[in-house]
């Protein structure tokens, strides 16, 4: 058993049929010695009396908020949560496996630039009785500070018969140099509680590997005289690291017809303009990627040809 | 993804082309190592990230763009000084910091060159003949060093009398290639920045 927060304890249980469970001794936080009674989850049933209460925790029915009272007055609380271990593996029931980029990916993170700011998100099908806490650091043996905000519900989606909820959190490395060469990864730890079930999830990455620039901005077309060609121009996204001559991007320009089956013409360039043939009813899209370190491409910025 | 091949203009900062070739070569070599050594811990997640130039050169600090010198997190240590007579210094107005930056890059290349050559000698003794260093990568390192043209004492190639542990050597190769790729990215950024200035 270990303390998660003040008056909140996690009992780690090997989860299998007829498991013996864990014996837990609760102590009432009071100088009083006599006339103390214990209840669970505001039940009127008295579980025991005295300054300590010994319980055998085997299942979720044994977890919950234990309260000690004296003469109708509440003295203290202890909330017991369960962390299940099945076949030597901690349970991952609360979050959904996103399976991208690989199996057992529960947390996904992205950064728009090298400032040390990043966003992580996760999915669940659970709608209520859910709370999260996020901690992060650079490295684990001698951790350097990363500050994370509160996790918030960022999207709701319908997937077949199920509703899916996306939570996200923003974190910022306390003293980040955009030009630094990372040798220690960022560690992200998410604590999750659903009802009386506790789980924790972790992710480890270098900012350079989770970079995904915003799409190029101010995408414009300029028709060239007496030609089906147009000059496409765009700018670096505002959120990209500066100076741009140091943090350079490369671009992919795509001409796509109305039908998805039509052949796509693609051009790669390091410049912020390109000349392409604009077909009728086609659209021109441009996306960006770090020029020197191949992490993710941005989403497309698009304009119609007409 | 292969990086786009840049054809340098005659007046272009002379080292940019070489640094782009360097990044392409090390990226290809790293990809080849990860494929060939698929049963070795050779991915970014599996290896220990070591920097053989740590405490010996200060490329990131010495080559910091002017715009980032206001960022206190970027200014850890800037006291290293090097020889200052490189041929990449196209402009007369080249600052002392730029010379320091380029000489730091030169020192990095020299250290990696020695490490790679020593390692290649060991890998050539491996009866499995599983992996060798790409001669193109070694040549590109050499070309960039020549373009930087700093006078520096030659570092003798390390020789080892004991029987090489080929497993350890291959893991060290992965560690070295990952680190060198990261440094090659920095070098490319620096050359791009200096070219734009």
């Amino acid at each position: 058993i270990w303390e998660l927060k003040k008056d909140v304890y996690v009992v780690e249980l090997d989860w299998y049929p007829d498991a013996p469970g864990e014996m837990v001794v609760l102590t009432c936080d009071t100088p009083e010695e006599d006339g103390i009674t214990w209840t669970l989850d505001q039940s009127s049933e008295v579980l025991g009396s005295g300054k300590t209460l010994t319980i055998q925790v085997k299942e979720f029915g044994d977890a919950g908020q234990y309260t000690c009272h004296k003469g109708g007055e509440v003295l203290s609380h202890s909330l017991l949560l369960l962390h299940k271990k099945e076949d030597g593996i901690w349970s991952t029931d609360i979050l959904k496996d996103q399976k991208e980029p690989k199996n057992k990916t529960f947390l996904r993170c992205e950064a728009k630039n090298y400032s040390g700011r990043f966003t992580c998100w996760w999915l669940t099908t659970i709608s209520t009785d859910l709370t999260f806490s996020v901690k992060s650091s650079r490295g684990s043996s001698d951790p350097q500070g990363v500050t994370c905000g509160a996790a918030t519900l960022s999207a709701e989606r319908v997937r077949g018969d199920n509703k899916e909820y996306e939570y996200s959190v923003e974190c910022q490395e306390d003293s980040a140099c955009p030009a630094a060469e990372e040798s220690l990864p960022i560690e992200v730890m998410v604590d999750a509680v659903h009802k009386l079930k506790y789980e924790n999830y972790t992710s480890s990455f270098f900012i350079r590997d989770i970079i995904k620039p915003d799409p190029p901005k101010n995408l414009q077309l300029k028709p060239l005289k007496n030609s089906r060609q147009v000059e496409v121009s765009w700018e670096y996204p505002d959120t990209w690291s500066t100076p741009h001559s140091y943090f350079s991007l490369t671009f992919c320009v795509q001409v796509q017809g109305k039908s998805k089956r039509e052949k796509k013409d693609r051009v790669f360039t390091d410049k912020t303009s390109a000349t392409v043939i604009c077909r009728k009813n086609a659209s021109i899209s441009v996306r960006a990627q770090d020029r020197y370190y191949s992490s993710s491409w941005s989403e497309w910025a698009s304009v119609p040809c007409s | 993804r292969n990086l786009p091949v840049a054809t340098p203009d005659p007046g272009m900062f002379p080292c940019l082309h070489h640094s782009q070739n360097l990044l392409r070569a090390v990226s290809n070599m790293l990809q080849k190592a990860r494929q060939t050594l698929e049963f070795y811990p050779c991915t970014s997640e599996e290896i220990d990230h070591e920097d053989i130039t740590k405490d010996k050169t200060s490329t990131v600090e010495a080559c910091l763009p002017l715009e980032l010198t206001k960022n206190e997190s970027c200014l850890n240590s800037r006291e290293t000084s090097f020889i200052t007579n490189g041929s990449c210094l196209a402009s007369r107005k080249t600052s002392f910091m730029m010379a320091l930056c380029l000489s730091s890059i030169y020192e990095d290349l020299k250290m990696y060159q020695v490490e790679f050559k020593t390692m290649n000698a060991k890998l050539l003794m491996d009866p499995k003949r599983q992996i060798f260093l790409d001669q193109n990568m070694l040549a590109v390192i050499d070309e960039l060093m020549q373009a930087l043209n700093f006078n520096s004492e030659t570092v003798p190639q390390k020789s080892s009398l004991e029987e090489p542990d080929f497993y350890k050597t291959k893991i060290k190769l992965c560690i070295l290639l990952h680190a060198f790729r990261i440094r090659a990215v920095t070098i490319d950024r620096v050359m791009s920045y200096l070219n734009a200035s």
Partner: nanobody
């Protein structure tokens, strides 16, 4: 901050029925238990019924067999179905929620109360 709003109180004759509702809104986190308390004029507040996060109900002896507590998890609502009401059930009924926020810790919230009067 968790807000609780009770409704469903009113004047009813002895033997009659009422259904109280309490909706929790705001930053709820994980609810560990929901309960109904009551306070008659000049009396101490007393626990009437509670329901654990696992749905286990508990009742004060005087209401057993007459009152039923239930919870709609999806709506964060707790109900108290009161049948065979007696004059001694007259009181202000308060909703109570206890829960956990991992960022801030344990919390307890109370509703303003809804008046139940049993009289002929």
């Amino acid at each position: 901050e968790v807000q609780l709003v009770e409704s469903g109180g009113g004047l009813v004759q002895p033997g009659g029925s009422l259904r109280l509702s309490c909706v929790a809104s705001g930053s709820i986190g994980s609810i560990t238990s929901m309960a109904w308390y009551r306070q008659g004029t000049g009396k101490q507040r007393e626990l009437v019924a509670s329901i654990s996060s696992g749905g286990r109900p508990s009742y004060q002896d005087s209401v057993k067999g007459r009152f039923t507590i239930s919870r709609d998890n999806a709506e964060n609502t707790v109900y108290l179905q009161m049948n065979s009401l007696k004059p001694e059930d007259t009181a202000v009924y308060h909703c109570n929620v206890r829960g956990l926020h991992l960022d801030t810790g344990l919390y307890e919230s109370w509703g303003q109360g809804t008046q139940v009067t049993v009289s002929s």
